[in-house]
Interface confidence: medium
């Protein structure tokens, strides 16, 4: 039975040209995390594998940085980065857990950070 839950940074906003940290945290399960995938709609941004470490998709290498922890940092944001982001936790023996984050990249100089909290 899958008992775990994923906490995420929820709906967040950031300024164009700035950076943002996407974070998810899997709790309430003793399952082993074997891999975490970060995806934007249907595009793979990065993978953190328990044995092979991090892999950043070549097309995002200049704008995506791993961490902190299993999170992902998006840099040099553009309005086109607005959209849904998913953290997909592959675990054993539970299976797959998915968390959703909605990022809005604003043109304005004041981006309100709604539902933003720090997960280690």
């Amino acid at each position: 039975m899958m008992t775990g839950t994923i906490e995420t940074t929820g709906n967040i906003s950031a300024e164009k040209g700035g950076s943002i940290i996407l974070q998810c945290h899997l709790s309430s399960t003793t399952a082993q995390v074997t891999q975490v995938n970060w995806e934007q709609q249907d595009q793979l941004l990065a993978i953190c594998n328990a044995d092979l470490g991090w892999h950043i998709s070549p097309s995002f290498k200049d704008r995506v940085a791993p961490g902190p922890g299993l999170g992902l940092t998006l840099q040099s944001l553009t309005v086109n980065d607005t959209g849904e982001y998913f953290c997909i936790y592959h675990t054993y023996p539970d299976g797959t857990y998915t968390g959703r984050i909605f990022l809005e990249v604003l043109e304005s100089s004041v981006a309100e950070h709604g539902a933003r909290f720090q997960i280690p």
Epitope: S27, G53, P66, G67, P68, P120
Partner: antibody, heavy 118, light 107 residues
Framework: QVQLQQSGAELVKPGASVKLSCKTS????????IQWIKQRPGQGLGWIGE????????YYNEKFKGKATLTIDTSSSTAYMQLSSLTSEDSAVYSC???????????WGQGTSVTVSS | DVQMTQTTSSLSASLGDRVTISCRAS??????LNWYQQRPDGTVKLLIY???KLHSGVPSRFSGSGSGTDYSLTIRNLEKEDIATYFC?????????FGGGTKLEIK
């Protein structure tokens, strides 16, 4: 097998700088974080910071900002830490270590002893 | 910063004994607790990560447990090669802080 080979012991004068190296082998250098840890006798271990060779991203412990600078050379799979404006408080053994996600260090270098003395 | 406290700085035990080393965090660290072994020659090895998961190649006589702020490392059937200093480390919140270490000696 995974190995992190650090440079030899250093004796440096107060006010000087020193650059320590950590040559890695046995794994894909650009896929793991390299962390640096300080150990002084009787004072335990202190986390200095980490660098991700795949992107050059760094995170520092606030206590070491301005003191330590972390860099990498991907062509030789080597990580470096430069320590500046050295004082006797910087005399310690400095270790590099490999980490998948920052939360766990799975392999350590053998450490480099730095002695600051006039 | 999260403070990590190992109240016992040194411990003496006999070969074959069961030994428990404790570590306390100043706040809840959500099981992100690692144990490292530092041999007298300075070599450091990861033993346990995420409270209770055994690192590859580590003998099964080592085990870890705990939650919240209190954690422990247990060594069953103590062997000569286990003579070392043991450090706990929290990986929950940067900067990742270490305990002061517990030096294990043979009686």
């Amino acid at each position: 097998q995974v190995q992190l080979q650090q440079s030899g012991a250093e004796l440096v004068k107060p006010g000087a700088s020193v650059k320590l190296s950590c040559k890695t082998s046995g794994y894909t250098f650009t896929s793991y974080w390299i962390q640096w840890i300080k150990q002084r006798p009787g004072q335990g271990l202190g986390w200095i910071g980490e660098i991700f060779p795949g992107t050059g991203t760094t995170y520092y412990n606030e206590k070491f900002k301005g003191k330590a600078t972390l860099t990498i050379d991907t062509s030789s799979s080597t990580a470096y830490m430069q320590l500046s404006s050295l004082t006797s408080e910087d005399s310690a053994v400095y270790s590099c270590a490999r980490s998948r996600d920052g939360k766990v260090v799975d392999y350590w270098g053998q450490g480099t002893s730095v002695t600051v003395s006039s | 910063d999260v403070q990590m406290t190992q109240t016992t700085s040194s411990l003496s035990a006999s070969l074959g004994d069961r030994v428990t080393i404790s570590c306390r965090a100043s706040q809840d660290i959500s099981n992100f607790l690692n144990w490292y072994q530092q041999r007298p020659d300075g070599t450091v090895k990861l033993l346990i990560y995420y409270t209770s998961k055994l690192h590859s190649g580590v003998p099964s006589r080592f085990s870890g447990s705990g939650s919240g702020t209190d954690y422990s490392l247990t060594i069953r059937n103590l062997e000569k090669e286990d003579i070392a200093t043991y450090f706990c480390q929290q990986g929950n919140t940067p900067p990742y802080t270490f305990g002061g270490g517990t030096k294990l000696e043979i009686k």
